[in-house]
Interface confidence: medium
C-alpha cells in the first residue's frame, strides 16, 4: 500500500479515505513533493506582506513587504521598516546618524565618513548624515606656489581603492 502513495505526484495527496487514491490538493493548499499524505495550507500574504508569487498546487506562495518595509528572515518571514536616508534602524526604531557618520540608504547602519587625510587628500565637500565626504586634492596641491602644470587627480568614489 505504501507504494501506491509514493506514486502520487506533487500537487496531489494520498487520500486514505479513498483507498489511497491520489487526490488533487484542495484550493489554497499545495504539495511540493510526491507521496504526501496531506497538502500544506498556502501562505497568505496580507497586511504588511504582499504577494510576490501566487500559490500553486505544487508550490507555496511567496511574499514580499509593502512599500516602506523590507524583508527579513527566511522566505521573508518578517518585514522590517525602512528608515530615511541619514538614519539607521535600531531595535527601538529609526535614529539619526551621529555626527561623523552617514547612511545614504533606507536600510543598513550609519557608517563613518571617509578619512581623506589617510590618503593624503583634503576634504572637498563636507559630509552630512546622508552623504559621505568628498575627498579632493592633497593640501600640498592647493598651497600657494604649487605647480599647476598637471591638474589634480579626480576625486575618487568613497570606498574605492586607488588603481
Amino acid at each position: 500500500l505504501q507504494d501506491l502513495c509514493s506514486n502520487c505526484p506533487a500537487g496531489t495527496f494520498c487520500d486514505n479515505n479513498r483507498s489511497q487514491i491520489c487526490s488533487p490538493c484542495p484550493p489554497n493548499s499545495f504539495s511540493s513533493a510526491g507521496g504526501q499524505r496531506t497538502c500544506d495550507i498556502c501562505r497568505q500574504c496580507k497586511g504588511v506582506f504582499k504577494t510576490r508569487k501566487e500559490c500553486s498546487s505544487t508550490s507555496n506562495a511567496e511574499c514580499d513587504c509593502i512599500s516602506g518595509y523590507h524583508c527579513l528572515g527566511a522566505e521573508c518571514s518578517m518585514c522590517e521598516q525602512d528608515c530615511k536616508q541619514g538614519q539607521e534602524l535600531t531595535k527601538k526604531g529609526c535614529k539619526d546618524c551621529c555626527f561623523g557618520t552617514f547612511n545614504d540608504q533606507k536600510r543598513g547602519i550609519c557608517r563613518p565618513w571617509t578619512n581623506c587625510s589617510l590618503d593624503g587628500k583634503s576634504v572637498l565637500v563636507n559630509g552630512t548624515k546622508e552623504r559621505d565626504v568628498v575627498c579632493g586634492p592633497s593640501p600640498a596641491d592647493l598651497s600657494p606656489g604649487a605647480s599647476s602644470a598637471t591638474p589634480p587627480a579626480p576625486a575618487r568614489e568613497p570606498g574605492h581603492s586607488p588603481q
Partner: nanobody, 124 residues
Framework: EVQLLESGGGLIQPGGSLRLSCAAS????????MTWVRQAPGKGLEWVST????????YYADSVKGRFTISRDNSKNTLYLQMNSLRAEDTAVYFC?????????????????WGQGTTVTVSS
C-alpha cells in the same frame, strides 16, 4: 545546523498569561545573547526583549516593561518569554532570534538566526 524552534503561542483572553519557549540547537547557547521580536498583523517588526548570554542582563521595550519577563536556561538550551497582563495589542507572531555576540546589541543587524515564529492572539 543552527535552529530555533518557538512554541507556547495560542489564543488567550485579555489579562491572561502565556509562556513562550524557544528551543535552540546547533550552537553553544550560553555564548550568545538572545532576543524576542514580534510582528503584529499589518505592522512591521517590533523588538520586545533581549537577554545576554549569561542571563545577567535583560532589556525590554517600553510597551512590555513590567508585564513580560525574558529568561533562559542554558543547561536546557532554551529561551523563555513569560507574558502577563496580556492586551489585545500584544497579538502578533513572536520570533526568537540569536545575536552574534554574548552581549546585547542595539541593532537587528547583529541577529544572525531567526526562528519561524509562534502566533499569540489576545482576544475575548
Amino acid at each position: 545546523e543552527v535552529q530555533l524552534l518557538e512554541s507556547g503561542g495560542g489564543l488567550i483572553q485579555p489579562g491572561g498569561s502565556l509562556r513562550l519557549s524557544c528551543a535552540a540547537s546547533g550552537f553553544t547557547f550560553s555564548s550568545f545573547a538572545m532576543t524576542w521580536v514580534r510582528q503584529a498583523p499589518g505592522k512591521g517588526l517590533e523588538w520586545v526583549s533581549t537577554i545576554s548570554g549569561s542571563g545577567d542582563n535583560t532589556y525590554y521595550a517600553d510597551s512590555v516593561k513590567g508585564r513580560f519577563t525574558i529568561s533562559r536556561d542554558n543547561s536546557k538550551n532554551t529561551l523563555y518569554l513569560q507574558m502577563n497582563s496580556l492586551r489585545a495589542e500584544d497579538t502578533a507572531v513572536y520570533f526568537c532570534a540569536k545575536e552574534d555576540t554574548a552581549v546585547a546589541s542595539d541593532y537587528y543587524y547583529n541577529i544572525d538566526v531567526w526562528g519561524q515564529g509562534t502566533t499569540v492572539t489576545v482576544s475575548s
